[in-house]
Interface confidence: medium
């Protein structure tokens, strides 16, 4: 949950190209104004995933998900909350 | 704001070579399964995508990191 | 009941063009990627293009590369392979197979065949 | 590119005998292996997907094993109707075919 907070477009994006759909790429991809030549990209990886199979995306997704709540990240999730919380409080 | 630990991750999925990649998973997950697959899914990437694929594809995640949506 | 049925084949001399057809029926057309895979007399299979499920993505073996036009219309329900510049050695039974959803199972099922022969 | 080497090229099998084909990749293709099951003067029809997953309505005798760079398609038990061509296919960057194993009836 909060990885996907951190940065929601992007891990939309991740799981539509890992998920194999296309359809549910070109959403996501819209939502950021892709161009043809961007969505053509996008398109190539998502190939790679759909050609490998559902055991290839389960585990790449496992990789996405480890790094994204990693200390490397939480840590400076907690470190973003502390910030905000403190421009919060001096805001007040 | 995207974790530097998944841009890094990206970036190299993208730019760098099949070893740096796999290198920079195993500091996360070190199962061999999943280095195994994540050395396919590169190769496959680098395979398929020419340069100007990987400049559009970055310059998608500029889009996507710079969003208001992140 | 999954129907594909391959059609345009037949003799055009070195340097011809030729376009094959594909007419899918008894599934969804738009949902699956497509293949074409063509067989010489006697010979394995070769596989020479697909193509995404909207048309997006397209791949071709670097034997037709530049030569071969994958494209598809939903709509219709139709495959199609533009084949320019014919070669004699790409003489074969050019088949149309599909994929299962997303991929999850390249050619399950497969059409007849047509026969292209390049020859003068 | 990668490349399918399958072996035997040929087999000549005596019915209820065990066939084993092997596929080796030229470099590692996790599971993104197939097996096609090729009789004359008809299409290739999937036997199994995915290295080790059978196709709905392939006979049980038809298994698959294998991940990276070996793979074995094994009939358990040959009947006639098993001489064939068979074919493996890899699936993990674009695509490409092995040679073909033919396998004869005694």
């Known amino acids: 949950v909060k990885m996907a907070e951190t940065c929601p477009i992007f891990y939309d994006v991740f799981f539509a190209v890992a998920n194999g759909n296309e359809l549910l790429l070109d959403l996501s991809l819209t939502k950021v104004n892709a161009t043809e030549p961007e969505r053509t990209a996008m398109k190539k990886i998502q190939d790679c995933y759909v050609e490998n199979g559902l055991i290839s995306r389960v585990l790449d997704g496992l990789v996405m998900t480890t790094i994204s709540s990693s200390k490397d990240c939480m840590g400076e999730a907690v470190q973003n909350t502390v910030e905000d919380l403190k421009l919060n409080t001096l805001g007040r | 704001e995207i974790c530097p630990a998944v841009k890094r991750d990206v970036d190299l999925f993208l730019t760098g070579t099949p070893d740096e990649y796999v290198e920079q998973v195993a500091q996360y997950k070190a199962l061999p399964v999943v280095l195994e697959n994540a050395r396919i899914l590169k190769n496959c990437v680098d395979a398929k995508m020419t340069e100007e694929d990987k400049e559009n594809a970055l310059s998608l995640l500029d889009k996507i990191y710079t969003s208001p949506l992140c | 009941e999954v129907q594909l049925v391959e059609s345009g084949g037949g003799l055009v001399k070195p340097g011809g063009s030729l376009r094959l057809s594909c007419a899918a029926s008894?599934?969804?057309?738009?949902?699956?990627?497509m293949n074409w895979i063509r067989q010489a007399p006697g010979k394995g299979l070769e596989w020479v293009s697909y193509?995404?499920?909207?048309?997006?993505?397209?791949y071709y073996a670097d034997s037709v590369k530049g030569r071969f036009t994958i494209s598809r219309d939903n709509a219709k329900n139709s495959l199609y392979l533009l084949m320019n510049s014919l070669r004699a050695e790409d003489t074969a039974v050019y088949y149309c197979?599909?994929?299962?959803?997303?991929?999850?199972?390249?050619?399950?099922?497969w059409g007849q065949g047509t026969l292209v022969t390049v020859s003068s | 590119e990668i490349v399918l080497t399958q072996s035997p090229d040929f087999q000549s099998v005596t019915p209820k005998e065990k066939v084993t084909i092997t596929c080796r990749a030229s470099q590692s293709i996790g599971g993104s292996l197939h097996w096609y099951q090729q009789k004359p003067d008809q299409s290739p029809k999937l036997l199994i997907k995915y290295a080790s997953q059978s196709f709905s309505g392939v006979p049980s005798r038809f298994s698959g094993s294998g991940s990276g760079t070996d793979f074995t398609l094994t009939i358990n038990s040959l009947e006639a109707e098993d001489a064939a061509t068979y074919y493996c296919?890899?699936?993990?960057?674009?695509?490409?075919f092995g040679q073909g194993t033919k396998v004869e009836i005694k």
């Open positions: 193509i995404s499920s909207s048309g997006s993505s397209i």
């Open positions: 008894g599934f969804t057309f738009s949902d699956y990627y």
């Open positions: 296919l890899q699936s993990s960057s674009l695509r490409t």
């Open positions: 197979a599909r994929d299962g959803k997303y991929n999850s199972s390249p050619g399950d099922y």
